[in-house]
Structures are given as C-alpha cells and as structure tokens.
C-alpha cells in the first residue's frame, strides 16, 4: 500500500510535471508567438485512456515529436532550451509511471494539435493530483 | 498626446455587415500590436482579436471567427474591423487597445479607445 | 482557454479604508521567459478600461502608490491602502500569457 510519503513524492512530482506542461503551453499558445500557426500544423497522438500514472506512458513516446517542435519556438518564448525541458519531463514521467511494468499505449483515432495534446496532459495531472490531496 | 478614436458603430440587422474605424495618434501607430475588445451591456469585457504591428500575423476569439477580418494601415494609423453575418450576440461597445510590440516593458494593453456601440437587432 | 475568476464580485468600502481584490487562474500563468503576464484594470461608469497594473506588480504611469499588485503563479491580489471617491467602478484582472481572457470585474462602491 502507499505510504503518505509515497503519496506526496508522487504528488510533488505531478505538481512539477504540471508546471512544465503549463508552462510550455503558455510559450506556445500565445498571440505573439511567430511560429504559433506553423505549430499547430504539427500531429500528436492522443491516449485512448489517462486515468492512472501507467498511461504516462502515451506521453514517453511523444517527448521527442514534443522536442522537435518545440525547437522551432523563438528563445524569447523559452528561456529553456527545449532538449533541457523535454529531459526533465522525462525524469518525472520515468518515475510517476515506473519502469517495472511495461505497459502498451493505446492511442485514440484523432489526433490533435499541440495545444489540444499539451491540454490533455495537463488535465491529466489536475486529474491525478485532486484524487491524491 | 496618445490618443484612439473609434468610428463606424451603428445599428445594423442581423446577417449585415458593418466595419469599425480606429484612429491612433500621438504615437508610432507601426510598433504596436492592436487589439479589439468588446462589451456587451452590463456585461464584462471579451477579446475579440489581435493583429501584429506590422500585419503578419492576427487572431480572433472562437466567437468571432471566420465572420470577423482585422486589418489595418500603418500609412494612415488606422486599425480595422469588418464585421460580417452580424448576430444579436455580437451588440457591444467595441474598444481598441495598443500593445507595445518592440519594447521590453511589456505593458500589455496600455491605452484605449473611448469605443463604439454596434448594436445587431431586427 | 485559460478562465479567470474574481472575487469579490461586488465590494462596498468605506473612504480611507483599504480594499482586496482576489483573482485566480485556471492554470499557472508562468512562461518560460519567467513572466507573468497578469493585468489589473479599472473602468468607471461610461469610461473605457485604464490599465493600473502590469505584470504582478507594476504600477502603469500615474497610477497611484496606494494601487498594489501582488500574487505568483495562479493567485493575484489588487489591494488600495485606502480607497478615494474616484476609485469606485469595476475592476478586471486579465491575463496575456495566452490569449487575452479577463475575470469577470469586481464593483467597488463606497457604502
């Protein structure tokens, strides 16, 4: 069973996880960002399911289409350079979900812009982090 | 001084056309983003849409989009705003706002207009 | 869109008396460049909006020193150390780390 230690690392984590997320949105979705437009052109696949920490997994593999994109982002948008970003999303996420399950990401129909894709990750860690506190 | 003076409100039918003038003076009109902004009475105010300080690039609110085009004239200091397929939804004081696109202030909407009324009824 | 929530939405004060405003986010209005692009507005009957504050904390020219702005992340507060006849109308908080979105304006009266 998890401990309340256990249950603050992993919310502490989420709340990191969350910032991150937010905070490459607000970069991204913003009028005056110059290759917003030329982003949302981009296609990210969405999870079928979020609901529990092993579905972080449909996140993993779209860190590297994330990256990618986000190098096309001006250095006035990110005062982090998206490699460093991305890293440390990895960290979190290799630890929120565990590495001792292997789990398959099922993926919905639809795909999404990185605006939609980031929301939904972002929803997800609300999800997760109201049910811990 | 600074100053921007909104025209071309009215009352209009609803599926009618109307466009909003904004005149800027009193600065350099061509380094600033411009905005619109609306209120509906009583109500708060709603964006509505943002064109770049040298029209390259210009969004729009959910609401608005594809009946709203946002333009302007950086020869004559003037921002636009054609209003097509007009619905009641749409009756508001229309504001337009300066944004500081060069600086490094980062003001935001620092000066704006007194507004024009459009009012869409049948 | 980011939603942005004010409370109160009507507030009666006394003359020389201080006055709060809260604003919340929906989500952190952080970006990467470290900014927080959070405005406080004020619109008297008739008036188009003036702006006060920028980012946080900045007062706008001529704003008067007993306007503040405080908050980090998701949570702002407008505070007037002590309110004058002319500070009555509708205050908006609005952010432009996204796309514009205002809260929904705090009346402040003198009771």
């Known amino acids: 069973a998890p401990t309340s230690s256990s249950t603050k690392k992993t919310q502490l984590q989420l709340e990191h996880l969350l910032l991150d997320l937010q905070m490459i949105l607000n970069g991204i979705n913003n009028y005056k960002n110059p290759k917003l437009t030329r982003m949302l052109t981009f296609k990210f696949y969405m999870p079928k399911k979020a609901t529990e920490l092993k579905h972080l997994q449909c996140l993993e593999e779209e860190l590297k289409p994330l990256e990618e994109v986000l190098n096309l982002a001006q250095s006035k948008n990110f005062h982090l350079r998206p490699r460093d970003l991305i890293s440390n999303i990895n960290v979190i996420v290799l630890e929120l979900k565990g590495s001792e399950t292997t789990f398959m990401c099922e993926y919905a129909d639809e795909t999404a812009t990185i605006v939609e894709f980031l929301n939904r990750w972002i929803t997800f860690c609300q999800s997760i982090i109201s049910t811990l506190t | 001084q600074v100053q921007l003076v909104e025209s071309g409100g009215g009352v209009v039918q609803p599926g009618r056309s109307l466009r909003l003038s904004c005149a800027a003076s009193g600065f350099t009109f061509s380094n600033y983003g411009m905005h619109w902004v609306r209120q509906a009475p009583g109500k708060g105010l709603e964006w509505v849409t943002v064109i770049w300080n040298d029209g390259s690039n210009e969004y729009y609110a959910d609401s608005v989009k594809g009946r709203f085009t946002i333009s302007r004239d950086n020869s004559k200091n003037t921002l636009f705003l054609q209003m097509n397929s007009l619905r009641a939804e749409d009756t508001a004081v229309y504001y337009c706002?300066?944004?500081?696109?060069?600086?490094?202030?980062?003001?935001?909407?620092?000066?704006w207009g007194q507004g024009t009324t459009v009012t869409v009824s049948s | 869109d980011i939603v942005m929530t004010q409370t109160p939405l009507s507030s009666p004060v006394t003359l020389g008396q201080p006055a709060s405003i809260s604003c919340r986010s929906s989500?952190?209005?952080?970006?990467?460049?470290?900014?927080?692009?959070l405005s406080w507005l004020h619109q008297r009957p008739g008036q188009p909006p003036r702006l006060l504050i920028y980012?946080?904390?900045n007062r706008f020219s001529g704003v008067p020193d007993r306007f503040s702005g405080s908050g980090a992340g998701t949570d702002f507060t407008l505070k007037i150390s002590r309110v004058e006849a002319e500070d009555v109308g509708v205050y908006y908080c609005m952010q432009t780390t996204q796309f514009p979105t205002f809260g929904q304006g705090t009346k402040v009266e003198i009771k």
């Open positions: 989500q952190s209005l952080v970006r990467s460049d470290g900014n927080t692009y």
């Open positions: 980012k946080i904390s």
């Open positions: 706002a300066r944004e500081d696109w060069l600086g490094e202030a980062d003001y935001g909407m620092d000066v």
